[in-house]
């Protein structure tokens, strides 16, 4: 579906940035980044009818325009605006699943519960999931050697700004009851510094969102504590309540059984607490 034509049309120099150039603390751009983004876009738009009219070449032009020739510590949300626009997607706003520090289970869940969506189930999230990218100031080259680390180098790097921007928009689009999956095995079940805690929580729209429902995922088989009473969950409840959004919380004691029951809800063992 035109992928070869698209690759042929690429005139940007995709060679590696020479090793003597700026070294950052984080890993470099994922190898074959342009090809990966384009291939993912083509695949996604073929599978999702509502995005079939999206032109993947334009999407790639917008993506590369956000970071190519720009200093990788000086990226803004405005740089990503064209990509955000082309990737605008109408997902059912009452079927949104946010997550924090428990991506795999959240994705397993939406793979089974097909009418719910994580950010990575949208075009833009799917394009960038698990990828790293950066360029460098005043050259059209992609840096495959190293990219800025959020902590050690700078927060306004291409990857961090992308996820901040796309996460904000995803949260802004949510309505009715929004679900969030949280990792009960971590010391901070709710972390104010996570993308969920620093971006998504603050961009839920109170005029559209009635309730945030947290699902706290337990790690150990014998863990029967009520993690909804955890101080960090109470902190989340306080933040949400102050924003005039209701809060509810559920313990998911057995994530394996939880997924099984999502697959087979009529199973007799699925009536008890999971």
């Amino acid at each position: 579906s035109g992928l070869n034509d698209i690759f042929e049309a690429q005139k940007i120099e995709w060679h590696e940035v020479p090793r003597w150039r700026q070294q950052w603390s984080g890993p470099g751009t994922t190898k074959r980044f342009p090809e990966t983004v384009l291939a993912r876009c083509v695949k996604y738009t073929e599978i999702h009818p509502e995005m079939r009219h999206v032109d993947c070449q334009s999407v790639w032009d917008a993506f590369k325009g956000a970071f190519i020739s720009k200093h990788p510590c000086n990226i803004t949300e405005e740089d990503y605006q064209p990509l955000m626009k082309l990737g605008t997607q109408t997902v059912p706003c009452n079927k949104i699943l946010l997550w924090s520090r428990i991506k795999d289970l959240a994705h397993q869940f939406t793979q089974v519960q097909r009418d719910m969506f994580t950010l990575e189930d949208t075009l833009l999230g799917y394009l960038a999931d698990d990828l790293t990218w950066c360029g460098e100031f005043n050259t059209s080259k992609i840096n495959y050697q190293s990219c800025p680390d959020w902590r050690k180098d700078c927060s306004n790097n291409p990857v961090s700004v992308f996820w901040k921007t796309v996460s904000r928009r995803f949260a802004e689009a949510a309505c009715d009851v929004v679900h969030v999956m949280l990792n009960g095995s971590r010391s901070k079940i709710f972390d104010k510094n996570s993308t969920f805690g620093s971006v998504e929580v603050h961009n839920l729209q109170p005029e559209k969102v009635q309730t945030l429902e947290a699902w706290v995922i337990h790690g150990g088989r014998e863990d029967s504590r009520d993690l909804c009473q955890d101080p960090t969950i109470k902190e989340l409840e306080s933040i949400i309540s102050k924003r005039n959004i209701q809060f509810s919380c559920k313990n998911i004691y057995r994530p394996d059984k939880f997924l099984q029951c999502v697959k087979n809800p009529e199973d007799s063992s699925c009536t008890s607490e999971i």
């Epitope: 999206v54 334009s58 325009g65 020739s69 955000m84 605008t88 109408t90 802004e172 689009a173 559209k208």
Partner: antibody, heavy 123, light 110 residues
Framework: EVQLLESGGGLVQPGGSLRLSCAAS????????ICWIRQAPGKGLEWVAC?????????YYADWAKGRFTVSKDNSKNTVYLQMNSLRAEDTAVYYC???????????????WGQGTLVTVSS | DIQLTQSPSTLSASVGDRVTITCRSS????????LAWYQQKPGKAPKLLMY???NLASGVPSRFSGSGSGTEFTLTISSVQPDDFATYYC??????????FGGGTKVEIK
């Protein structure tokens, strides 16, 4: 003051081509999406295409416009163009260029419009 | 193709009347509320009245209000003034950054 001024309309035969221009003034041209919207006589509005040029050109089109219509931009002249090929009678319309509201909370709406230029496709 | 259906297509009103125009979208608009309303007078370009369903554009009188979400929206003029006799269009914003307009509602003097 924000101003958009379309030109280039006129009478063209079916199968012919025409290039419309939209000259912009009063704002930072590169920082906005400029779109073309048309209105057939006595009918409603129909979106055609959009372009944005922060560095390279980023453009996209309504499905029906792909292939026949091309949007482009000359930053030195602060002008957006709409090249229309293989014109048909049903392309007869007033063609407006419009500037989208700036900022992600406002994208998707047109705050400033030109006065329009009439394209008539007829033999 | 996305369809935006406005009703009624024509509406007769007197100065001071309360007027309501409905816009229905065949698909949910982006973000559940990404819908605009425009006013157009003969021979003129459209003028933005409302955005994000219920936000008044700059300089628009407060007698105009908007509501709705998802696929169903309304524009209300609480007390029609002589300057309000015009055609009104709704416009939705959708996946891929695409736009669609309604067919228009002409508000004429009774």
């Amino acid at each position: 003051e924000v101003q958009l001024l379309e030109s280039g309309g006129g009478l063209v035969q079916p199968g012919g081509s025409l290039r419309l221009s939209c000259a912009a003034s009063g704002f930072s041209f590169n920082n906005y999406w400029i779109c073309w919207i048309r209105q057939a006589p006595g009918k409603g509005l129909e979106w055609v295409a959009c372009i944005y040029s922060p560095s390279g050109d980023i453009k996209y089109y309504a499905d029906w416009a792909k292939g026949r219509f091309t949007v482009s931009k000359d930053n030195s002249k602060n002008t957006v163009y709409l090249q229309m090929n293989s014109l048909r009678a049903e392309d007869t319309a007033v063609y407006y260029c419009a500037r989208e509201l700036s900022g992600s909370s406002y994208e998707g709406y047109f705050e400033s419009w030109g006065q329009g230029t009439l394209v008539t496709v007829s033999s | 193709d996305i369809q935006l259906t406005q009703s009624p297509s024509t509406l007769s009103a007197s100065v001071g009347d309360r007027v309501t125009i409905t816009c229905r979208s065949s698909q949910s608009v982006y973000g559940h509320n990404w819908l605009a309303w425009y006013q157009q007078k003969p021979g003129k370009a459209p003028k933005l009245l409302m955005y994000r369903a219920s936000n008044l554009a700059s300089g628009v009188p407060s007698r105009f209000s908007g509501s709705g979400s998802g696929t169903e929206f309304t524009l209300t003029i609480s007390s029609v003034q002589p300057d309000d006799f015009a055609t009104y269009y709704c416009q939705g914003y959708y996946s891929g950054g695409s736009y669609a307009f309604g067919g228009g509602t002409k508000v004429e003097i009774k």
